[in-house]
Interface confidence: medium
């Protein structure tokens, strides 16, 4: 069967910056900002796009040693990320995979809402353990808050990039960070 769990959470961080840090660079950030939750992330195959397989290892003392995630979709425009847990962790005799969708939506106050959908694909008529859903939710919350704290403490990290016109750059068009933009306009 398929059991769907949906939740929402808020962040004070703007959507574009959060997507860049939490989703696109989570592999590097998570072990750095939340070593108590994730010890390492390694790419088994792929370059981060759809089809990429990642192995996420957990520190000793947590219930599972590792999980393998498969990236299914990365939508940079709509800040959407789909992936599936396909091996390790709770995957086994009763659970085939967990399909996850994270969408980060900008809010008028400059923060964001994360809309999260977790679909548990069980084998036969097995049900999902409530504690598994709770543990997964808590892990997500731990990672999000750790990334959020990092971003609050490092205001220059993962800033949105702006496309500067050829005119502004004297015929050269390129992606430029806000920090570079500040520098460019003052020199």
């Amino acid at each position: 069967g398929v059991f769907n769990y949906e939740t929402e959470t808020t962040s004070v961080i703007p959507a574009a910056r959060l997507f860049k840090a939490f989703i696109l660079d989570g592999d590097n950030l998570f072990p750095k900002v939340a070593p108590q939750a994730i010890s390492s992330v390694e790419n088994i195959e792929g370059n981060g796009g759809p089809g990429t397989i990642k192995k996420i290892s957990f520190p000793e003392g947590l219930p599972f040693k590792y999980v393998k995630d498969r990236v299914d979709e990365v939508d940079h425009t709509n800040f959407k990320y789909n992936y599936a847990v396909i091996e390790g962790g709770p995957i086994g005799d009763t659970l085939e995979k967990i399909s996850n969708e994270i969408k980060i939506v900008a809010t008028p106050d400059g923060g964001s809402i994360l809309k999260i959908s977790n679909k548990y694909h069980t084998k036969g008529d097995h049900e999902v353990k409530a504690e598994q859903v709770k543990a997964s939710k808590e892990m997500g919350e731990t990672l999000l808050r750790a990334v959020e704290s990092y971003l609050l403490a490092h205001s220059d990290a993962y800033n949105e990039q702006k496309l500067i016109s050829e005119e502004d750059l004297g015929g050269e068009q390129k992606l430029i960070s806000e920090e570079d933009l500040h520098h460019h306009h003052h020199h």
């Epitope: 939740t7 004070v12 809010t107 106050d109 923060g111 919350e141």
Partner: antibody, heavy 120, light 107 residues
Framework: QVQLVQSGAEVKKPGASVKVSCKAS????????MHWVRQAPGQGLEWMGW????????NYGQKFQGRVTMTRDTSITTAYMELSRLRSDDTAVYYC?????????????WGQGTLVTVSS | DIQMTQSPSSLSASVGDRVTISCRAS??????LNWYQQKPGKAPKLLIY???NLQSGAPSRFSGSGSGTDFTLTISSLEPEDFATYYC?????????FGQGTKVEIK
Amino acid sequence: QVQLVQSGAEVKKPGASVKVSCKASGYTFAAHYMHWVRQAPGQGLEWMGWINTYTGGTNYGQKFQGRVTMTRDTSITTAYMELSRLRSDDTAVYYCARDRRNWNFVFEYWGQGTLVTVSS
Amino acid sequence: DIQMTQSPSSLSASVGDRVTISCRASQNIKNYLNWYQQKPGKAPKLLIYEASNLQSGAPSRFSGSGSGTDFTLTISSLEPEDFATYYCQQSFSIPWTFGQGTKVEIK
């Protein structure tokens, strides 16, 4: 430990404005939304709005739009709520409240309250 | 706006009694329901969040249940310090709204 300390009681005339402050300590100020909730004498609780303390963006309850302004000063970890064009029915205790930062807007920590009396 | 209706509006009970307070939402709010305790002249205190989760520091005699539109706060065995007013609050959609309160008085 987390503390929210509000400014003292105010007495205002109808038509005037009042600005209430809420000094936060014991946590990362910018990581949490700050909400304002009021309670008229002998009445229930009424949510007025929030401020995103990181971006400064606000979300006001429709009832208060156009009359309320929420601001913050991150350098002194203080949030402010200003209510203009006061009427007698704005007489209430005004609370600031910090959210819990879980998957839900929950008012986990509250200031001690500021009594605002509107009287001619 | 979502209306929150509590019942009863007040009740009298004795120390040691089991007390239940109901809260009904005007539409489905899933489990986005929180309970607060307020004593006279004091700020409210969070007791239960997300319908059934006990806030850290809140006594274990308090419990919450329900989902959708109907919710219950239960005090398993009333203590003298539990005489107060209790409010439910929905955080499913803006504006966040509270119930009108239930005052628990000494019999």
